[in-house]
């Protein structure tokens, strides 16, 4: 898979492959995988990809199911890259406060908050 | 501050306090704090709260600015709790795939993806 494929296209294709291979993936009825209990997905990327790893090790490889796991591995690579960018730029306090304000604003309006 | 205050109310109050104390917080003109370079805030919570720690250590405490940092510490506590909930429940593959599909769907529609 060329890593040059835009990440947005990669995600779309992965969603389609996930749908296609669902029957094969759920064949193991005794397997249990940790599932986050809330919808703030970005907080749980580590656990999600650990789960994908567990699933991959239990799935017969070959054909396009292999492509599914390759895609998921590229998505992980993208997210790891984004995480690296969390601390790259050192800026003045004012700019940090603008980012913090935006973060809290998004938390206020978009997060699913259970008290 | 009672920890029983709903997190959503806590975030709103913190936004107001941030605005109130901005002048005091930016007084240190030479301080530099890492600022994430993308809008996927949830991926960067660790770095954001490290930055808050740096800022707190450089800010003269007292009055309601103390309340601001207490609030931010409670928000961190809430987020840490959410992170713990990422791997608490072990579920069948089918349920994991539903979560994965939702995660990729949200990534597809809501994340700010730069190729």
């Amino acid at each position: 898979i060329p890593t040059e494929i835009p990440t947005s296209a990669l995600v779309k294709e992965t969603l389609a492959l996930l749908s296609t291979h669902r029957t094969l993936l759920i064949a193991n009825e005794t397997l249990r995988i940790p599932v986050p209990v809330h919808k703030n997905h970005q907080l749980c990327t580590e656990e999600i990809f650990q789960g994908i790893g567990t699933l991959e090790s239990q799935t017969v490889q070959g054909g396009t199911v292999e492509r599914l796991f390759k895609n998921l591995s590229l998505i992980k690579k993208y997210i790891d890259g984004q995480k690296k960018k969390c601390g790259e730029e050192r800026r003045r306090v004012n700019q940090f406060l603008d980012y913090l304000q935006e973060f809290l604003g998004v938390m206020n309006t978009e997060w699913i908050i259970e008290s | 501050i009672p920890t029983e205050i709903p997190t959503s109310a806590l975030v709103k109050e913190t936004l107001a306090l941030l605005s109130t104390h901005r002048t005091l917080l930016i007084a240190n003109e030479t301080l530099r704090i890492p600022v994430p370079v993308h809008k996927n805030h949830q991926l960067c919570t660790e770095e954001i709260f490290q930055g808050i720690g740096t800022l707190e250590s450089q800010t003269v405490q007292g009055g309601t600015v103390e309340r601001l940092f207490k609030n931010l510490s409670l928000i961190k506590k809430y987020i840490d709790g959410q992170k713990k909930k990422c791997g608490e429940e072990r579920r069948r593959v089918n349920q994991f795939l539903d979560y994965l599909q939702e995660f990729l769907g949200v990534m597809n529609t809501e994340w700010i993806i730069e190729s």
């Epitope: 700019q95 603008d98 304000q101 935006e102 | 600022v35 994430p36 700010i112």
Partner: antibody, heavy 117, light 109 residues
């Protein structure tokens, strides 16, 4: 490498509104590490900071121009814009857009705007 | 608001050292940035955070800052250094950018 390009009319009539757009390429305007700024330079004079904006919409303006200036951002187009109202001949200048981290990192090439009837 | 004062012009012979000053109240407590601007071109950063050089800027360019004066020093001046030089600081309350009036460096000869 981030590149910035100013666009807009080179001639504006007195009392009208000057409107310029800056298109950012080679980087995202949603980059949390940057503000997006406008600076101008009157003929033969020094640089004058007009204002800047964060991707979230937070704006900061030069107090001497604040009453006439509006800076906005369009993250979907990777652009930010300047509007300066009630212009006079004193607003004739080269207008630059620039990315602003701890300093002005990247600049547009500048566009001359003349205010004349 | 905060004011930065620069001499309008400085002249120097090739090979000599040019010093361009930037005055401001207690400027030593701020970070100072210096830009070089040649005719018809956009400014280019030559010194940031008082004395640090961006990559690609010759070692001949250096800066210092203390008390009420920041100084840009260009040693072994070359004809190609002829340009306008502007200092810049942040005025933190509220977060505004301030430029000096600019200094025209003329290389004699």
């Amino acid at each position: 490498q981030v590149q910035l390009q100013e666009s807009g009319p080179g001639l504006v009539k007195p009392s009208q509104t000057l409107s310029l757009t800056c298109t950012v390429s080679g980087g995202s305007i949603s980059n949390g590490g940057y503000y997006w700024s406008w600076i101008r330079q009157h003929p033969g004079k020094g640089l004058e900071w007009i204002g800047y904006i964060y991707y979230s919409g937070s704006t900061y303006y030069n107090p001497s121009l604040k009453s006439r200036v509006t800076i906005s951002v369009d993250t979907s187009k990777n652009q930010f814009s300047l509007k300066l109202s009630s212009v006079t001949a004193a607003d004739t200048a080269v207008y630059y857009c620039a990315s602003l981290g701890n300093w002005f990192d990247y600049w547009g090439q500048g566009t001359l705007v003349t205010v004349s009837s | 608001s905060y004011v930065l004062t620069q001499p309008p012009s400085v002249s120097v012979a090739p090979g000599q050292t040019a010093r361009i000053t930037c005055g401001g109240n207690n400027i030593g407590s701020k970070n100072v940035y210096w830009y070089q601007q040649k005719p018809g071109q956009a400014p280019v950063l030559v010194v940031h955070d008082d004395s640090d050089r961006p990559s690609g800027i010759p070692e001949r360019f250096s800066g210092s800052n203390s008390g009420n004066t920041a100084t840009l020093t260009i040693s072994r001046v070359e004809v190609g250094d002829e340009a306008d030089y502007s200092c810049q600081v942040w005025d933190s309350s509220p977060d505004h950018v301030v430029f000096g009036g600019g200094t025209k460096l003329t290389v004699l000869g």
